[in-house]
Interface confidence: low
Amino acid sequence: EDWQCPRTPYAASRDFDVKYVVPSFSAGGLVQAMVTYEGDRNESAVFVAIRNRLHVLGPDLKSVQSLATGPAGDPGCQTCAACGPGPHGPPGDTDTKVLVLDPALPALVSCGSSLQGRCFLHDLEPQGTAVHLAAPACLFSAHHNRPDDCPDCVASPLGTRVTVVEQGQASYFYVASSLDAAVAASFSPRSVSIRRLKADASGFAPGFVALSVLPKHLVSYSIEYVHSFHTGAFVYFLTVQPASVTDDPSALHTRLARLSATEPELGDYRELVLDCRFAPKRRRRGAPEGGQPYPVLRVAHSAPVGAQLATELSIAEGQEVLFGVFVTGKDGGPGVGPNSVVCAFPIDLLDTLIDEGVERCCESPVHPGLRRGLDFFQSPSFCPNPPGLEALSPNTSCRHFPLLVSSSFSRVDLFNGLLGPVQVTALYVTRLDNVTVAHMGTMDGRILQVELVRSLNYLLYVSNFSLGDSGQPVQRDVSRLGDHLLFASGDQVFQVPIQGPGCRHFLTCGRCLRAWHFMGCGWCGNMCGQQKECPGSWQQDHCP
């Protein structure tokens, strides 16, 4: 009988304590927001906001420019000065709540917690491969804004998400803000609004459309906007909010809100509950039917999927899928089952479910007792009636009013609970070759790059490494610049290659050569490495 090498256990073929050093930038304060820009003439930039300051970095993460965004009332505040001679409001620090690109101009828009949540527009000026910010424009017209009606009050100190959409020649800002009674009383930001940026950059056009939590619910009904994105004909917001206006406000669930990206209207505003569960292969006694619910969304990202995952999700390759990391509650603390689970919601399926929900509400035969919902935004009513009305009048359409779809969209953990104790705090999904990879940041400052596949009893790691020594949580927002992802942790920004930081964590030649093609790994004497790391022989096709 032939002698065979003893099999190395899979886990023993890699070492996740291997240190990788990736390029980084120290921002000088807790990173509050970050966004990247790639121009069509090879120029690129990373914009990093901390309290009272905005940094402009080159593609190598070297500082190119720095701008003082606060404190408001301080003579050194460069953005404040763009609004002309003050005072413009109470003095105070500026925490950046919104940092987005308007790609059409192109320009960077920043909005802070000070000065009624107003925004500033910074035109981008390419200089070689780097980018500079032009002098900021103050997006605030004093004569247009009142405490009860303020088109230029965009950012809420409690958090705001913005997605910019080009419609014709105009830029529309789809804005979602968390409110409470105090914030709502001060220059009245709205929960959800669509605002047109005025062509002369003096602010936003008045008369914008908006939905807001009704005053009577502001104290108890808090909506957290976790993520927003634009794909196809729609803009989507993802929220964590109480499951009911009338019941326990601490019983939370996750919703997807859909708005038209082609018409700046809110009549076709729709919400759908997203239900993510952990369903172990073998159900324990007493475990809930259908799996354990993970109702609270922590982070999300949408991306087109590779062939393998597409097949598993029964969709076409390249179709857009919304990925979410969910936890059991706000604290995300330990319970039975894993700390974090990942669910995948194909966008086309989401849209179909929403459209079917509209049909159920608006088409005969009428389903008795079917509520229009969204009672925190509008007067209660039953389908097909408009909010607050007993019946449809002949010249109104059931479809032209906001609606909560009556069914939810259920999915189970793609990783089958294998994330275990890991608390995921950041997520970005990419397609590499035909592989779909989840790039995840964790509560303890690590990066996990894992292939997204179902039905395995182990995780397929591209990498699992520590970003630095601080062990601080990786922040929610991740940006891409070329073939790199930018993660923030504490006061640092880190640049992580999407192909992984290297190959040294693969300990055996067999495991090294079975790494994904895109990682570029080969056996190099006695270690796994990329060709540039190997002065001598580098073997990609067979082991010695």
């Epitope: 014709g168 020649q169 529309y172 005025k198 003096s202 008369g207």
Partner: antibody, heavy 119, light 107 residues
Framework: EVQLQQSGAELVKPGASVKLSCTTS????????IHWVNQKPDQGLEWIGR????????KSDPKFQVKATITVDTSSNTAYLQLSSLTSGDTAVYYC????????????WGQGTSVTVSS | DIQMNQSPSSLSASLGDTITITCHAS??????LNWYQQKPGNIPKLLIY???NLHTGVPSRFSGSGSGTGFTLTISSLQPEDIATYYC?????????FGGGTKLEIK
């Protein structure tokens, strides 16, 4: 009901100026754009320019930049088109129209003002 | 400026016919194309916006299609009240420009 009411026909001499008005009702003028379009006898439509009443921002065809000035008075919901240094070639019907969202489409039109330039 | 070329410039058809008018843009205008109808002695009226969206109150026998540089307006089952001149107009960039018009007559 959305309406755009234009001022009456004008007969003017070459070299003179004229100011046409367009008074809107049934909607808030600052929530839309107001466009001006002309149509010469037995010819097609020609875009002159538009104004954003919310902030007075104007866009116009370069060939009309000297000839035409668009203004707005939001307090009276009225847009104006001033035409200067008129020649017989400026004889046309001038329409104001409401912008449809930001699609650069015009969904409601005034009845038109006929301007005849003749000595 | 973006040129809009409309063809044919005139067209004669019988009641009940289906007719097609085409509009070609000199550069890519995505879907930012609008169609108008102007009946003799009347003001223009918006028929279709953003290439294929029927404006409120416009009969469903009118339809629009296309994107990029090529667009069509189709009228199925021609009616007497469809006698008019039809114009396309691009909304992609300033200055906005119209096609030269297509005059539709009934045989």
């Amino acid at each position: 009901e959305v309406q755009l009411q234009q001022s009456g026909a004008e007969l003017v001499k070459p070299g003179a100026s004229v100011k046409l008005s367009c008074t809107t009702s049934g909607f808030n003028i600052i929530d839309t754009y107001i466009h001006w379009v002309n149509q010469k006898p037995d010819q097609g439509l020609e875009w002159i320019g538009r104004i954003d009443p919310a902030d007075g921002n104007r866009k116009s065809d370069p060939k009309f930049q000297v000839k035409a000035t668009i203004t707005v008075d939001t307090s009276s919901n009225t847009a104006y088109l001033q035409l200067s240094s008129l020649t017989s070639g400026d004889t046309a019907v001038y329409y104001c129209a409401r912008g449809y969202g930001n699609l650069n489409a015009m969904d409601s039109w005034g009845q038109g003002t006929s301007v005849t330039v003749s000595s | 400026d973006i040129q809009m070329n409309q063809s044919p410039s005139s067209l004669s058809a019988s009641l009940g016919d289906t007719i097609t008018i085409t509009c070609h843009a000199s550069q890519n205008i995505n879907v930012w194309l609008n169609w108008y109808q102007q009946k003799p002695g009347n003001i223009p009226k918006l028929l279709i916006y953003k290439a294929s969206n029927l404006h409120t109150g416009v009969p469903s026998r009118f339809s629009g299609s296309g994107s990029g540089t090529g667009f069509t307006l189709t009228i199925s089952s021609l009616q007497p009240e469809d006698i008019a001149t039809y114009y396309c107009q691009q909304g992609q960039s300033y200055p906005l420009t119209f096609g030269g018009g297509t005059k539709l007559e009934i045989k």
